[in-house]
Interface confidence: low
Amino acid sequence: KFSKQSWGLENEALIVRCPRQGKPSYTVDWYYSQTNKSIPTQERNRVFASGQLLKFLPAAVADSGIYTCIVRSPTFNRTGYANVTIYKKQSDCNVPDYLMYSTVSGSEKNSKIYCPTIDLYNWTAPLEWFKNCQALQGSRYRAHKSFLVIDNVMTEDAGDYTCKFIHNENGANYSVTATRSFTVKDEQGFSLFPVIGAPAQNEIKEVEIGKNANLTCSACFGKGTQFLAAVLWQLNGTKITDFGEPRIQQEEGQNQSFSNGLACLDMVLRIADVKEEDLLLQYDCLALNLHGLRRHTVRLSRKNPIDHHS
């Protein structure tokens, strides 16, 4: 559950985040699971720990393995696992499936291809983009921050897109590449002001203290592929990542589904070991797209245990 797959290429930088998150003030210790050997924090090492991040600068095939991170606070320890695989560079152009990040879709009106994992790195624009190993050229392609924007998308634009950037660590530069597939949707779609299907507005969800609870934020945005549509959770008006409660986590990545032809997104909020203070929080499901933003609020209430003796 608290394990994450990460992969990279030899001689490139790879940065991995601990799957268990905590406040910035918490200390995070990293270990190589096979030997239980502590990962050093000194930056002179090729592989070193830096808080929630584990850095391979650069990575080597021999670094492959499972790494344990332990988030330590004054009151608890949380353990996570990073399953790291470093591959040899391919001599030919084909990018194997195991090196591919999630597929994204576009349509003729708009398209954005996000460079995967880039937020973990210290990079500067512009990114370099390649399609099927060829550098992209022409006015239809725009490297915009961490995105590639393709104007007037055609079916021939489908393919594997690789972003390449430089990670800088204390003046030293390391190359990073990441590849994902891009598909082109032909359908005529439309987008609407977000419609939140769940939770209901001002919903009260019953939970049991000490148990785990899940809240799902689900919204529909129109028909066909939607651009710049998102659902997310806030706690007391604060982003989950800023709130700093490691027990409450937003599921990474949004699930896209098509319900009755409508494009919908859902985001699960997982609350581990529900506590009394969780009942005092306001949970907001936010749905936003180019048309606007909509919120539904949920509060938690204690589920009364069933009296089996009556």
Epitope: K145, L288, G292, R295
Partner: antibody, heavy 119, light 107 residues
Amino acid sequence: EVQLLESGGGVVQPGRSLRLSCAASGFTFSSYWMSWVRQAPGKGLEWVSSISSDSSYKYYADSVKGRFTISRDNSKNTLYLQMNSLRAEDTAVYYCARDGLRWDAFDIWGQGTMVTVSS
Amino acid sequence: DIQMTQSPSSLSASVGDRVTITCRASQSISSYLNWYQQKPGKAPKLLIYAASTLQRGVPSRFSGSGSGTDFTLTISSLQPEDFATYYCQQSYSTPLTFGGGTKVEIK
């Protein structure tokens, strides 16, 4: 010191265009959503438009949709409002405002720039 | 669109008075309600966000309460510098909307 400074206001004839600028300083401009809010003489506040930190999201009031365009240049720490097909009812003081990082509230405001649309 | 209705539109009060301004939303906005103060010829200033959270640097005599559709801004003991116009604003959904304002004048 955190500061927003609007410029570009003035007197303009109906149907003409004007471009407002807002120079930001004292904070990491590229991390914040930014907005324009206006106030007609003797009237209340009216939200005009908002733009996300990376320009992905742009929202407009119905009264300006199709005529006004919000944009930003993070490299120059500057927010813009391109106003086309101006009408008499667009006459107002235009404020540039910063949206809070953690809450949707306008926590920093500029001093405002006056736009007068008159023939 | 969500309409925000403020009342009263104006009030007269003396220094030291307790002043209450109300704001009503046309639909539930949870606690996505902000309060601003504006003095003549000046830009608005954020007083309270999230219905009841005091913005840094704002005196504690200002307080906010409410949730859903009904909200209140209270000044516990009016000071000379508090004579101004106060606006509520919802940030629940776009388009963002303000109340019509409440002008607090010297009695």
